[in-house]
């Protein structure tokens, strides 16, 4: 057993049939030492008399807020959460798998650029009685602060007959050096409570890996004389680290039909223009990745031919 | 060229030649994501591999005031790289295809040490720890660690040469 | 080469304050890590004070915390530490330290380079 913050405490457990639980001593948070009664939850059955209550934990049934008592009046809490650990893995019910980029993948993280700071989310099909926690630091031996405001719900999805809730967290790494190559991963600890059960769920990575620039801006065309090309123009995004002649990205531009079936012309270039043919009801698509480093590509920013 | 007495490197040619480490960093090991290479006992491997810290001057404002701090660490990790691909990390069993660009990766970062440092001018350099993994297999999986830490570390030595050819180039 | 020099230090009464002041040349100051350490007589050199390079984050030992302050002035190459309200216990060589991470780091082996000293005595 072990206290998650103020009076609540979550109990690790070993879950298969007939498993013994865990014994748990609960004590009174008070100088008083006689006329002490127990009780869980909204029930009024007195469970035990004194200072303290020794339990026997083995299911959600044990679980949950303990309270002393005296003479009808409360003295103190105690809300027992449970951890379930099957065939020596812990549960993962809360959340629910991204499968990208691989399998257990619960947290997502993205960074925009280099300052340090970063944006994690998650799902969950779970739509009541769900709180979340986020802690992070650079490295874990020495750690190094990162400051990760409140998880909130950030987006709600129908998918099938089921409904599925977007959860995410901005994170700041208080002393961000942006210029530095990362020697030691961000660590990123979500705690999940759902009723009575707790999960936890980490994610490591550094900046570098989850940088994902955003579009390009100000996509512009502008057709050259007697010429079925045009000048393609666009900016580095406003959120994109500077100076830019040291945080260097690299676009690709794309020349894309109506059909999707259409050949697909495709340009890379360091520069912040491109010569291409527009063909009539054609796009023309520009996306942005770091150009010494090949972490994610933008999403693309896009105009119309005509 | 970059002299340990403090004259200007050609921050161009120095740019060009980054750009290409970036390149071939990629292409010896383009596999993102593919493997949670930090999963695999990271510690012992290559912890020892000399990074670009806050404190080297590799920032924008570090090269203005004095470049010196920052190129010497570069050229640091250089020889050190350098040598970790011509050992037998990379030179022994399983064989690296013929046509593999860790040939090439080894040739420039010989090349850019020496635009960094000619002939006849010594910066210290940082000892190579002595990693001599026995099984094939170990080989294997400290060569992908080895091309993850260089493409991060060519990254930051091509940022700092694009600005240096951007901005501090006669 | 990398110098740290640090200076401020002496015998004062207990209660009382002294202001130590480490100048740094031969490396890049504005991307370092600041920290302070001490050594008591027969004791292990000991964590007190750090601050990250851009100052937004500060570290402190227990044994110090609302008494000793750590700041730094990027334009002098310096950071200080301002002691006050000492003690008997504060009787140590104080050394001054840079970290290439840039962190404020309590852990003596994030250190790289590292001053001489200089002996702060607090008498009752």
């Known amino acids: 057993i072990w206290e998650l913050k103020k009076d609540v405490y979550v109990v690790e457990l070993d879950w298969y049939p007939d498993a013994p639980g865990e014994m748990v001593v609960l004590t009174c948070d008070t100088p008083e030492e006689d006329g002490i009664t127990w009780t869980l939850d909204q029930s009024s059955e007195v469970l035990g008399s004194g200072k303290t209550l020794t339990i026997q934990v083995k299911e959600f049934g044990d679980a949950g807020q303990y309270t002393c008592h005296k003479g009808g009046e409360v003295l103190s809490h105690s809300l027992l959460l449970l951890h379930k650990k099957e065939d020596g893995i812990w549960s993962t019910d809360i959340l629910k798998d991204q499968k990208e980029p691989k399998n257990k993948t619960f947290l997502r993280c993205e960074a925009k650029n280099y300052s340090g700071r970063f944006t994690c989310w998650w799902l969950t099909t779970i739509s009541t009685d769900l709180t979340f926690s986020v802690k992070s630091s650079r490295g874990s031996s020495d750690p190094q602060g990162v400051t990760c405001g409140a998880a909130t719900l950030s987006a709600e999805r129908v998918r099938g007959d089921n409904k599925e809730y977007e959860y995410s967290v901005e994170c700041q790494e208080d002393s961000a050096c942006p210029a530095a190559e990362e020697s030691l991963p961000i660590e990123v600890m979500v705690d999940a409570v759902h009723k009575l059960k707790y999960e936890n769920y980490t994610s490591s990575f550094f900046i570098r890996d989850i940088i994902k620039p955003d579009p390009p801006k100000n996509l512009q065309l502008k057709p050259l004389k007697n010429s079925r090309q045009v000048e393609v123009s666009w900016e580095y995004p406003d959120t994109w680290s500077t100076p830019h002649s040291y945080f260097s990205l690299t676009f690709c531009v794309q020349v894309q039909g109506k059909s999707k079936r259409e050949k697909k012309d495709r340009v890379f270039t360091d520069k912040t223009s491109a010569t291409v043919i527009c063909r009539k009801n054609a796009s023309i698509s520009v996306r942005a990745q770091d150009r010494y480093y090949s972490s994610s590509w933008s999403e693309w920013a896009s105009v119309p031919c005509s | 060229r970059a002299v340990p007495g403090g004259s200007s490197p050609a921050w161009t040619q120095c740019q060009q030649l980054s750009q290409k480490l970036c390149t071939l960093a990629w292409s010896a090991h383009p596999l993102v994501g593919h493997m949670d290479l930090r999963e695999e006992g990271d510690e012992e491997t290559t912890n020892d591999v000399p990074h670009i810290q806050c404190g080297d001057g590799c920032d924008p404002q570090g090269l203005r005031d004095n470049s010196q701090f920052c190129l010497q660490r570069i050229h640091q990790g250089l020889i050190f790289y350098e040598k970790l691909l011509g050992s037998d990390i990379f030179t022994g069993e399983p064989s690296l295809l013929p046509d593999s660009p860790v040939g090439q990766l080894h040739a420039s970062l010989l090349g850019l040490s020496q635009l960094l440092q000619p002939e006849g001018h010594h910066w210290e350099t940082q000892q190579i720890p002595s990693l001599s993994p026995s099984q094939p297999w170990q080989r294997l999986l400290l060569r992908f660690k080895i091309l993850r830490s260089l493409q991060a570390f060519v990254a930051v030595a091509a940022r700092v040469f694009a600005h240096g050819a951007a901005t501090l180039s006669p | 080469e990398v110098q740290l020099v640090e200076s401020g230090g002496g015998s004062v009464q207990a209660g009382g304050s002294l202001r130590l002041s480490c100048v740094a040349s031969?490396?890049?100051?504005?991307?370092?890590?600041l920290g302070w350490f001490r050594q008591a007589p027969g004791k292990e050199r000991e964590f007190v004070a750090a601050?990250?390079?851009?100052?937004?984050?500060?570290n402190y030992a227990d044994s110090v915390k609302g008494r000793f302050t750590v700041s730094r002035d990027n334009i002098k190459n310096t950071v200080y530490l301002q002691m006050n309200s000492l003690k008997p216990e504060d009787t140590a060589v104080y050394y001054c330290?840079?970290?290439?991470?840039?962190?404020?780091?309590?852990?003596?082996?994030?250190?790289?380079?590292w001053g001489q000293g200089t002996q702060v005595t607090v008498s009752s």
């Open positions: 601050i990250a390079w851009n100052g937004a984050r500060i």
């Open positions: 031969g490396l890049y100051f504005n991307g370092n890590g």
């Open positions: 330290a840079s970290a290439r991470s840039g962190y404020a780091s309590i852990s003596i082996n994030e250190y790289d380079y």
